[in-house]
């Protein structure tokens, strides 16, 4: 094959090698560029941007090298338009820093910069940590600072990410209130900051006020939804991202749902409550209180990590005739408390005539309006469903 | 595998106090309540009580109402029996034991000898 | 509370042998009674479970009969390893009760 006249040459079935001296100063308008994975670049001097322009369009790229080249300068979104990109190789080039933001979200499992002339700061303090941790091919490179040693000898003691304070309100928030969220943020070369609400949606009406270093977030007309829902501050600076999320808590009164009981491996009456904070409960049949055992006990799902509702089963293993009757879930919370009821009837009474029939669980009578019980909301509920799980 | 590990023996005094340790492996802690089960040497089996790994809930025979305090430390994944104000009486084998898929000890400790000499 | 009154409380028997060992409980506890096996020295093993269903890993020689107030275990053509002690409990609610066993020994 005759040798290849262009500053760029086919390289393989996607690859693209370009090594005439000089030929380029930017990376726009490669040939086939869209189906590029693999794209090597050598001596060439007067590339020394490279910038998120010159990489769109290189959605499958996997590899690249830009080496013994004039690069001075990565932007820190220069691989937006790359993320399959997995080794990087900039070595021997004029690079002085190289950004944190630029590597992030990429999974390189290669990164070369030996060779470079890099200055020793804070904002390689990600590299010396690659080095530390083994990452990326970084420690077998020794990387040096232009005039200051190794990279590993660097101090980093003041090199920290951002410290951001959140302070919520102490009070009790109820349905309806508006509440102001502040951010305090503290630290080192501070560059931008900010809120996420992505899971606020119709939880209150947001308003955000002031800037670094303290921002603001009014939250008005709260609604009960706004419980269990992240709101973030997050700041960076040239060493990395901070990020510390809060709830608000908002009060509202018990709810509580029953139905009809259901047969699986062992029965269950299927329930869901709701409030804030989470409710007592307790269990009556036919009027008096149920002591639960380890034939008849409450058994929480598995809870949904951004809402207040439980659901749950009364959990009965072989009942009998027995056990039939009606069956009233009592929840309660400072605020308010409900009540439901419903008849299960799990077995025809053999002994219609024996109304002594002994019950194999025992009760104790109740003031239907007793509040005392144990709170719903507990951090290891057992995750029935999943497993058949007995006793 | 399903697994309650107890540690073999306990030599205590006459009027002490002992506690035994159970810890569960291979199953959801919290699915299951667990058992204590005592037995005299070349005795039957006696059920001691119940405790819900969830939320501490015991349930006792009468018997061994004022003798044991079942309790759990759901970290650990381990269930707990303190026998108190101990006599020769409380010499025995103590088994912890769960429930398998029907409401039967499908599962049992190696059990923990107590003897109780001065 | 339920008591399980099992018998006998002791028996001799020869291997090859087929043998019956008996529970009563003191009131209807349907079919919820369980039977357990236990060598000396080591944790009980359960057998049967509902009366009648054998529990996993457990040879079809043994088996469970009953209802009511009346149940069975039979273990037919004993083996060596069946001697030792065999426990009924009912399952029927708390406290849970065990018969006082049956000693099976080799005639």
């Known amino acids: 094959a005759a040798p290849c006249p262009d500053a760029c040459c086919p390289h393989g079935s996607s690859g693209l090698r370009c090594t005439r001296d000089g030929a380029l100063d930017s990376l726009h308008h490669l040939p086939g560029a869209e189906n590029l994975t693999e794209l090597y670049i050598e001596n060439q001097q007067h590339l020394q941007h490279l910038e998120l322009r010159d990489l769109r369009g290189l959605g499958e790229l996997r590899n690249l090298t830009i080496v013994k080249s004039g690069l001075r300068f990565v932007a820190p979104d220069a691989f937006h338009f790359t993320p399959r990109l997995s080794r990087l190789n900039l070595s021997f080039n004029a690079l002085e820093s190289l950004s944190w933001k630029t590597v992030q979200g990429l999974s390189l499992q290669e990164l070369v910069l030996s060779g470079n002339p890099l200055h020793c700061s804070c904002a390689l303090r990600w590299l010396q940590r690659w080095e530390e941790e083994g990452l990326g091919g970084v420690p077998e490179q020794k990387l040096q600072c232009h005039g200051q040693g190794p990279l590993a000898h660097m101090p980093n003691a003041s090199c920290g990410v951002p410290t951001l304070k959140v302070q919520v309100p102490n009070a009790s928030v109820d349905v309806g209130d508006d509440v102001l969220l502040r951010c305090q943020v503290e630290g080192r070369g501070l560059e931008q900051a900010g809120w996420i609400l992505t899971e606020l949606e119709q939880s209150a009406t947001v308003m955000k006020s002031g800037g670094l270093p303290s921002l603001g977030l009014t939250l008005a007309n709260v609604t009960s939804d706004l419980n269990r829902k992240n709101v973030t501050c997050w700041a960076e600076n040239d060493v990395g991202r901070a990020e510390v999320s809060v709830q608000v808590n908002v009060s509202f009164p018990a709810s509580v749902q029953l139905h009809t009981a259901v047969e699986m491996h062992h029965w269950c009456i299927p329930f869901s409550v709701d409030g804030q904070p989470a409710p007592s409960l307790r269990w009556l049949f036919n009027g008096s209180v149920l002591n639960e055992t380890s034939f008849i006990f409450t058994e929480f799902l598995e809870p949904a990590a951004n809402e207040t509702v439980r659901h749950g089963c009364l959990r009965l293993n072989q009942p009998t005739h027995v056990n039939n009757g009606n069956y009233t879930l009592l929840a309660a919370n400072p605020f308010g408390q409900a009540s439901a009821s419903i008849m299960a009837a799990f077995m025809d009474n053999p002994f219609e005539f024996n109304p002594e029939d002994p019950i194999p669980v025992s009760f104790s009578p109740v003031d239907t309006n007793s509040t005392s019980g144990d709170p719903v909301e507990k951090k290891d509920e057992t995750p029935f469903g999943v497993s058949v799980a007995v006793g | 595998q399903v697994q309650l590990q107890q540690p073999g023996a306990e030599l205590v005094k006459p009027g002490a106090s002992v506690k035994l340790s159970c810890k569960a492996s291979?199953?959801?802690?919290?699915?299951?309540?667990m058992h204590w089960v005592k037995q005299r040497p070349g005795q039957g089996l006696e059920w001691i009580g119940e405790?819900?790994?969830?939320?501490?809930?015991?349930n006792y025979d009468e018997k061994f109402k004022t003798k044991a305090t079942l309790t759990i430390d759901k970290s650990s994944r381990t269930a707990y029996i303190q026998l108190s104000s101990l006599t020769s009486e409380d010499s025995a084998v103590y088994y912890c034991?769960?429930?398998?898929?029907?409401?039967?000890?499908?599962?049992w400790g190696q059990g923990t000898l107590v003897t109780v000499s001065a | 509370d339920i008591q399980m009154t099992q018998s006998p409380a002791s028996l001799s028997a020869t291997v090859g042998e087929t043998v019956t060992i008996t529970c009563r409980a003191s009131?209807?506890?349907?079919?919820?009674v369980a039977w357990y096996q236990q060598k000396q020295g080591k944790s009980p093993q359960l057998l049967v479970h509902?009366?009648?269903t054998l529990a996993e890993g457990v040879p079809s020689r043994f088996s469970g009969s009953g209802s009511g107030t009346q149940f069975s275990l039979k273990i037919n053509g004993l083996h060596p390893e069946d001697f030792g002690s065999y426990y009924c409990?009912?399952?029927?609610?708390?406290?849970?009760?065990f018969g006082a066993g049956t000693k099976l020994e080799l005639k």
């Open positions: 034991a769960k429930y398998g898929n029907y409401v039967a000890f499908a599962f």
């Open positions: 291979g199953y959801t802690f919290t699915s299951y309540w």
């Open positions: 405790i819900n790994p969830n939320n501490g809930l015991t």
């Open positions: 009131e209807n506890i349907y079919s919820y």
């Open positions: 509902n009366a009648k």
């Open positions: 409990q009912h399952h029927y609610g708390i406290p849970l009760t």
